[in-house]
């Protein structure tokens, strides 16, 4: 599923991401834009044999199990396929674990490079939330 901007903002708010660990909703929408272009089925294979999955491009080396990444830690204890669902529950729950790890949203390079320090509230402007 490819979410609309406001549609995703509403879904993320419903799942408790607004101000989760101090990050406003706009940060999460911005991260999703630059990680996956709001596409829940986005996948990207990496040079180390791992793959990034879903709307927040969560990596199989550390966070989920796809059965083909040697030494996967599966810290979110989920199959990576769950991160491709049009229901973003699994991605949000895993994202909450990631952002709680100590480095906050810096864990998303796209957020660090494209969203951090910008007017992230623009990503939810005009949305009925």
């Amino acid at each position: 599923k490819v979410f609309g901007r406001c549609e995703l903002a509403a879904a993320m708010k419903r799942h408790g991401l607004d101000n989760y660990r101090g990050y406003s909703l706009g940060n999460w929408v911005c991260a999703a834009k630059f990680e996956s272009n709001f596409n829940t089925q986005a996948t990207n294979r990496n040079t180390d044999g791992s793959t990034d999955y879903g709307i927040l491009q969560i990596n199989s080396r550390w966070w989920c199990n796809d059965g083909r990444t040697p030494g996967s830690r599966n810290l979110c204890n989920i199959p990576c396929s769950a991160l491709l669902s049009s229901d973003i529950t699994a991605s949000v729950n895993c994202a909450k674990k990631i952002v709680s790890d100590g480095n906050g949203m810096n864990a998303w390079v796209a957020w660090r490079n494209r969203c951090k320090g910008t007017d992230v509230q623009a990503w939810i402007r005009g949305c009925r939330l």
Epitope: D52, W62, W108
Partner: nanobody, 133 residues
């Protein structure tokens, strides 16, 4: 508390070899990246080599490609830097560093090399390498 312990420096003739070691302790998970940097007198700190600790992908500065090899022992959270064909220009204090961010998406640890260590949040004490001609 996170600590990095570097060892293995010394003096060597040009053309010789040295192996540096860096042991990381205090991590519950990670580190994600480990790397080696160096600083010669009067010069900026520069990246030498880095490795993704999960996948083992390696990155090198152009000046050391083909001569230096970075490797890992994941069980010991230790990285090594094997330096062959050393040149007087390799003389510097060598520092190991770690990026403890466990990235959500895949991150190439080599990015920090060209920026003097951007993203690397833990640094070990230096070990002196002196190469004489």
């Amino acid at each position: 508390d996170v600590q990095l312990q570097a060892s293995g420096g010394g003096s060597v003739q040009a053309g010789g070899s040295l192996r540096l070691s860096c042991a990381a302790s205090g991590y519950t998970i990670g580190p994600y990246c480990m790397g080696w940097f160096r600083q010669a007198p009067g010069k900026e700190r520069e990246g030498v080599a880095a490795i993704n600790m999960g996948g083992g992908i390696t990155y090198y500065a152009d000046s050391v490609k083909g001569r230096f090899t970075i490797s890992q022992d994941n069980a010991k959270n230790t990285v090594y830097l094997l330096m062959n064909s050393l040149e007087p220009e390799d003389t510097a204090i060598y520092y190991c560093a770690a990026d403890s961010t466990i990235y959500a998406s895949y991150y190439e640890c080599g990015h920090g090399l060209s920026t003097g260590g951007y993203g690397y949040d833990s640094w070990g004490q230096g070990t002196q390498v002196t190469v004489s001609s």
